[in-house]
């Protein structure tokens, strides 16, 4: 019996088509992805093949102005229109709190939303009961398929799930649910979830009875043969894991941002064994036309976004200096504002011993592309912020050794004075440079804000200690020559849209007046 699994993950509000790097579409003839194009391909496959499932492995939320404005209603509406069969909860689905998940998505979705390792307690338990499920049995043709969901147990550190949701270990939580499916005579089981490729592989290895793993969170691109675009495969598609009980379990992921549609064909025998698995992600490029009815619906929903861009978010009573003359040479108050917003967006009081789980921010000065003048009545709009942060990136959470941070700060000034973008703006860090010294030896003092303390204070950086840092995804991926970050990072979790982080902070503060205060000397 042959099953076709179509899958997406980490779409992050890319409802409209995007350019090849998943930023705003500029030249339509070269654009990719978007729900209208996705629908065309999905329908094509549904017409051609008998047993098809369309699955999403989480993180539909967060990433563009679509989410900022519609807050998840857009996800429910367009996923319903595409007739998704199931979705797993990702960490970003909790970005607007549990209410921001329940009302727009859980109550509106016409498909099951799954996670076996999230357990509700207290007053939330009855409120959320039945709105998401540990698993769902879906009829597909003459057969039935069990889908069991999972979500990163790091979600409390990455988003805002509140105190009434417990995130259990994925493997521990999945096994009893899979066992339950087996007792219901369901012998074809897909684990659909959002914990990253390493955990996907572990689930394939450790959870008895899981036949296929469809994952997300790590934006992993897998491909067999010559890849069709710029993404470099992390392995073959599907990636085969040998389980502890000796079965070959296919593991798949489809990069991110709706650029690809994962396409996996599985042949099962009567016992539910995977006899064969093959496929590849399908690049959703302009050779695939956008579905006219979905496109018309997108255009209708788009109108509200254009209005939002010009509305006031808050006010500044000082000049926000985002000029390259400042931000690439010294501490600039736009850099301070952005870093403060980044830390504020990551406030998570999950442990009594820590005032917060992260205190540090670094930001390449070259990523700040415009100042904001306070003489326009102090008004700050989304449009203004889009000029400052035009690249559509995210502010991510990484774990780095102190020694890696030291290398990063040496790189920051290794060719100081040439107006290059690698000069770092900071938050929760005091750095002193001596530019008379030779490159690679210019950092003379590097103090960092403690986290395991009730009164935050600055302590010298310890080379062997592991620190959490918020930074742009551009830096996490080694941009501006920060190869040491990419090569040496111990953990990387993608975060919220850059503009959204700053806009939320400004809206929250109402009036801002960031200063230059001696973070960089």
């Amino acid at each position: 019996w042959e099953l076709t699994i179509l899958h997406t993950n980490d779409v992050h509000s890319r409802l409209e088509q995007t350019s090849e790097d998943s930023s705003k579409c500029v030249n339509a003839s070269r654009c990719m992805g978007g729900v209208a194009r996705l629908f065309t391909k999905v329908q094509q496959i549904r017409r051609a093949e008998p047993n098809v499932l369309l699955l999403d492995a989480g993180d539909q939320y967060q990433g563009t102005i679509w989410f900022t404005v519609y807050k998840g209603a857009e996800v429910a509406h367009f996923m319903n229109a595409l007739r998704y069969d199931a979705m797993a909860l990702g960490n970003h689905e909790f970005d607007n709190g549990v209410e921001g998940l329940i009302e727009p998505l859980l109550k509106e979705a016409k498909f099951p939303i799954l996670s076996a390792n999230i357990k509700a307690k207290g007053p939330l338990a009855s409120q959320i009961s039945g709105l998401y499920l540990p698993y769902k049995v879906l009829p597909v043709g003459d057969e039935v398929v069990g889908i069991v969901g999972y979500t990163s147990k790091e979600t409390p550190f990455l988003s805002n799930p509140g105190t009434n949701l417990v995130f259990e270990d994925e493997i521990t939580a999945l096994q009893p649910e899979v066992d339950k499916l087996k007792t219901l005579n369901v012998n074809k089981i897909i684990a659909l979830g959002h914990s990253g490729f390493e955990m996907d592989k572990l689930i394939a290895q450790k959870v008895r009875g899981v036949d296929v793993v469809v994952g997300g969170h790590s934006n992993t691109f897998l491909y067999t043969g010559n890849p069709p675009s710029k993404e470099v495969p992390a392995g073959k598609y599907p990636f085969i894991v040998t389980s502890d009980d000796g079965r070959k379990v296919p593991v798949v992921q489809a990069y991110a941002f709706g650029k690809y549609l994962g396409y996996l064909k599985i042949e099962f025998d009567e016992r539910g064994n995977v006899i064969s698995s093959h496929g590849n992600p399908i690049l959703l490029n302009s050779s695939i036309p956008e579905d006219p009815s979905i496109k018309a619906d997108i255009n209708k929903w788009r109108i509200k976004l254009d209005n939002y861009s010009t509305q006031e978010l808050g006010k500044t009573i000082v000049y926000l200096d985002g000029s390259s003359q400042s931000c690439r040479f010294r501490e600039c108050n736009m850099g301070n504002l952005i870093c403060d917003a980044m830390i504020n967006n990551n406030l998570r009081h999950t442990d009594e011993m820590f005032w917060n789980h992260v205190s540090m921010c670094i930001l390449n000065g070259g990523g700040i592309r415009s100042p904001i003048d306070e003489r326009n009545n102090g008004t700050i709009t989304w449009e203004n912020l889009a000029a400052v942060l035009p690249f559509g990136g995210t502010f991510d959470l990484v774990q780095l050794k102190g020694s890696t941070l030291k290398k990063a700060f040496e790189h920051s000034v290794h060719r100081y004075g040439q107006s290059t973008g690698e000069f770092l703006q900071v938050g929760g860090i005091h750095v002193v440079y001596d530019l008379s010294r030779k490159p690679g030896d210019r950092v003379v003092k590097l103090d960092v804000l403690c986290t395991k303390c009730r009164v935050p204070s600055y302590d010298p950086l310890k080379m062997d200690e592991v620190y959490k840092v918020i930074l742009p995804n551009f830096l996490a991926n080694g941009g501006d020559g920060f190869q040491m970050i990419k090569d040496e990072l111990l953990r990387h979790d993608s975060g919220d849209q850059d503009i959204n982080v700053v806009s939320t902070y400004i809206s929250k503060m109402k009036v801002i007046y960031p200063a230059v205060e001696g973070r960089i000397k």
Epitope: W1, N273, I275
Partner: antibody
Framework: EVQLVQSGAEVKKPGASVKVSCKAS????????MNWVMQAPGQGLEWMGR????????FYSQKFKGRVTMTVDKSTSTVYMELSSLRSEDTAVYYC???????WGQGTTVTVSS | DIQMTQSPSSLSASVGDRVTITCRAS??????LNWLQQKPGKAPKRLIY???SLDSGVPSRFSGSGSGTEYTLTISSLQPEDFATYYC?????????FGGGTKVEIK
């Protein structure tokens, strides 16, 4: 649990036909295939062909083409294999086996003797 | 048709021995290969499917490997109940074809 139950032993004269049945249970019958495999006394296994339960589509091995007919009765989840123009070398145990031979019937002995 | 050449046709071994059986296909069969065990008077039983996946209930001393045209069944430590005849089966293309069988006997 998948189960395949075959009909009993048969003794046939050369030139006659034999029809062996295989009743399946424990799975969604219409979604799969059934294979038929022959094993002559003291010999190895030989694949005869397969039938798709849902629409009756068949694929026969060249060696048996023209003499073998596989049919399906969806209402009783039963598959049949008929072999005609029997000769002594058709004396064998005939097995039905699921799509990828994960489960087998107990075998039906067919003796062709004058 | 794809020919499956199985070797050896028979072997004698003792309990605890490591036993290796090979199947060579006349052309590339991907990993569309099963291994089956048959005891006298009984129907065959599948041990391994898709080259290396172990059927449920089959002891982990059985393992399969290979690719392209060369495939191997290994019994890491032969047990008394393992004395039987073993067959490979390719299902990459019609007609499906079995190897000639390997009879594993007690030394």
């Amino acid at each position: 649990e998948v189960q395949l139950v075959q009909s009993g032993a048969e003794v046939k004269k050369p030139g006659a036909s034999v029809k062996v049945s295989c009743k399946a249970s424990g799975y969604t019958f219409t979604a799969y295939f059934m294979n038929w495999v022959m094993q002559a006394p003291g010999q190895g296994l030989e694949w005869m062909g397969r039938i798709y339960h849902n629409n009756g589509d068949t694929f026969y091995s060249q060696k048996f083409k023209g003499r073998v007919t596989m049919t399906v009765d969806k209402s009783t989840s039963t598959v049949y294999m008929e072999l005609s123009s029997l000769r002594s070398e058709d004396t064998a145990v005939y097995y039905c086996a699921t799509s990828y031979v994960g489960d087998w019937g107990q075998g039906t002995t067919v003796t062709v003797s004058s | 048709d794809i020919q499956m050449t199985q070797s050896p046709s028979s072997l004698s071994a003792s309990v605890g021995d490591r036993v290796t059986i090979t199947c060579r296909a006349s052309q590339d069969i991907g990993d569309s290969l099963n291994w089956l065990q048959q005891k006298p008077g009984k129907a065959p039983k599948r041990l391994i499917y898709a080259t290396s996946s172990l059927d449920s209930g089959v002891p982990s001393r059985f393992s399969g490997s290979g690719s392209g045209t060369e495939y191997t069944l290994t019994i890491s430590s032969l047990q008394p109940e393992d004395f039987a005849t073993y067959y490979c089966l390719q299902y990459a293309s019609f007609p499906w074809t079995f190897g000639g069988g390997t009879k594993v006997e007690i030394k």
